[in-house]
Amino acid sequence: DVERTTCPPEKEVHEIDESLIFYKKRELEACVDAALLAAQMDRVDAIPFTYEQLDVLKHKLDELYPQGYPESVIRHLGHLFLKMSPEDIRKWNVTSLETLKALLKVSKGHEMSAQVATLIDRVVVGRGQLDKDTVDTLTAFCPGCLCSLSPERLSSVPPSVIGAVRPQDLDTCGPRQLDVLYPKARLAFQNMSGSEYFVKIRPFLGGAPTEDVKALSQQNVSMDLATFMKLRREAVLPLTVAEVQKLLGPHVEGLKVEEQHSPVRDWILKQRQDDLDTLGLGLQGGIPNGYLILDLSVREALS
């Protein structure tokens, strides 16, 4: 913490300007009025403060706004944003996309994924939902940031906005996030024709249930291996060899390359070896001929 001193009369600060770069930390603390700093935040980013000096300015703002900064200050933080922790950002209420854009630009090239994720979260809370303008801003200024949101936040995306999401925006999404986004995508794209539908839904298929994957296998979509590998393990396991063959079309040969990786490995273990042999790929590990398969997932037989 910066120690308290009184400000020498000749160092009194009446406006935020470049002369402040010559102030020592102690002098900044003593001489800069927090309210003045807040009122003239738009000037701060143009002044080449050291990181140590920025620490002092942040400290001043923290004292003035212990419950969190107002958006008028947040909008003009500039490089001072780099000093913010997720805990600081959690106190904010942000509704302006201009504020979001400004801070996303500042964070570029810095290791600030936690801060950015928290900032986006605050924007979604502040705006009430993840609307089209917010999604457009994220995809333009922070590709991949959509996936930094929790499933709970993503649940506020209206299906009508899903069309604005690009495949690359979903690259870092995990299964729980895709579980939320996939049904919205299925609703949003349901009026499209088969081939157009598949192109649109493909990036979201990591959240699809078995029945949807089975239905796709009837539509000659020729799913690529990369998409197949992103399908939920639980969605792939019930598929028959014939269904997987129809689903992948000419890409079925890729199963050999992925033989040791989930979900292909787990799927192979559930198939009859005779059925796997019909693919002519040399896949090994299936259930030997003559063995009885008990499906214990159908619990009524046991209860």
Epitope: P151, S155, P159, S160, P175, R176, D179, V180, P183, R186, L187, F189, Q190, N191, Y197, I201, G207, A208, P209, T210, E211, D212, K214, A215, L216, Q218, Q219, E234, A235, P238, S297, V298, E300
Partner: antibody, heavy 122, light 107 residues
Framework: QVQLQESGPGLVKPSETLSLTCTVS????????WSWVRQPPGKGLEWIGY???????NSNPSLKSRVIISVDTSKNQFSLKLSSVTAADTAVYYC????????????????WGRGTLVTVSS | EIVMTQSPATLSVSPGERATLSCRAS??????LAWYQQKPGQAPRLLIY???TRATGIPARFSGSGSGTEFTLTISSLQSEDFAVYYC?????????FGQGTRLEIK
């Protein structure tokens, strides 16, 4: 074939929480989306919300603040909790399976439980 | 939310005759509409989806038509087991919404 069975108390006091469970038998809960739909006596149907086996949910905005839908894949069950109930929540509550086929890409219901009447009264 | 309005509230038709039930949406739902039949004390049963596609096991006398905001369910030759309440449901957007129902009774 797959069957659905609702269970839970038939009488709930006002301001308390209504709790129902739907048991899926004859198939895995993993393959579809599962919904709750209710029907007040002599009235039409109202969709409450759905759940996916992973726990992902979506519910009717008119009920969202009071609704919790959860799933227990180990028991092949999903549940509904509706808090702060009033007499207006008296209804037959159905659990239903959403068709979930991309070929028809729809959010409609091809399989229903028999329904269970829940009365809200002191 | 999309409001579904069914008409008439009650329709009286003689067995063997044709019944025509209507459903109107407050905004376009494209062809994302389903029809259900419900008999007293029973759960609804899916009849039609995609506005015009019959569900598995549904007799050919049931047919659906329409797109956008106006939809029709037609039962070409009424059988005794067809007298019930019929509901339409849109799935073009959440929340999923149902019509208030049309009661089809014997004349």
């Amino acid at each position: 074939q797959v069957q659905l069975q609702e269970s839970g108390p038939g009488l709930v006091k006002p301001s308390e929480t209504l709790s129902l469970t739907c048991t899926v038998s004859g198939g895995s809960i993993n393959n579809y989306y599962w919904s709750w739909v209710r029907q007040p006596p002599g009235k039409g149907l109202e969709w409450i919300g759905y759940i996916f086996y992973s726990g992902s949910t979506n519910s009717n905005p008119s009920l969202k603040s009071r609704v919790i839908i959860s799933v227990d894949t180990s028991k092949n069950q999903f549940s509904l909790k509706l808090s702060s109930v009033t007499a207006a929540d008296t209804a037959v509550y159905y659990c239903a399976r959403e068709v979930g086929r991309i070929a028809v890409a729809g959010w409609f219901f091809d399989l229903w439980g028999r329904g269970t009447l829940v009365t809200v009264s002191s | 939310e999309i409001v579904m309005t069914q008409s008439p509230a009650t329709l009286s038709v003689s067995p063997g005759e044709r019944a025509t039930l209507s459903c109107r949406a407050s905004q376009s739902v494209n062809a994302n509409l389903a029809w259900y039949q419900q008999k007293p004390g029973q759960a609804p049963r899916l009849l039609i989806y995609g506005a015009s596609t019959r569900a598995t096991g549904i007799p050919a006398r049931f047919s659906g038509s329409g797109s956008g905001t106006e939809f029709t369910l037609t039962i070409s030759s009424l059988q005794s087991e067809d007298f019930a309440v019929y509901y339409c449901q849109q799935y073009n957007n959440w929340p999923l919404t149902f019509g208030q129902g049309t009661r089809l009774e014997i004349k």
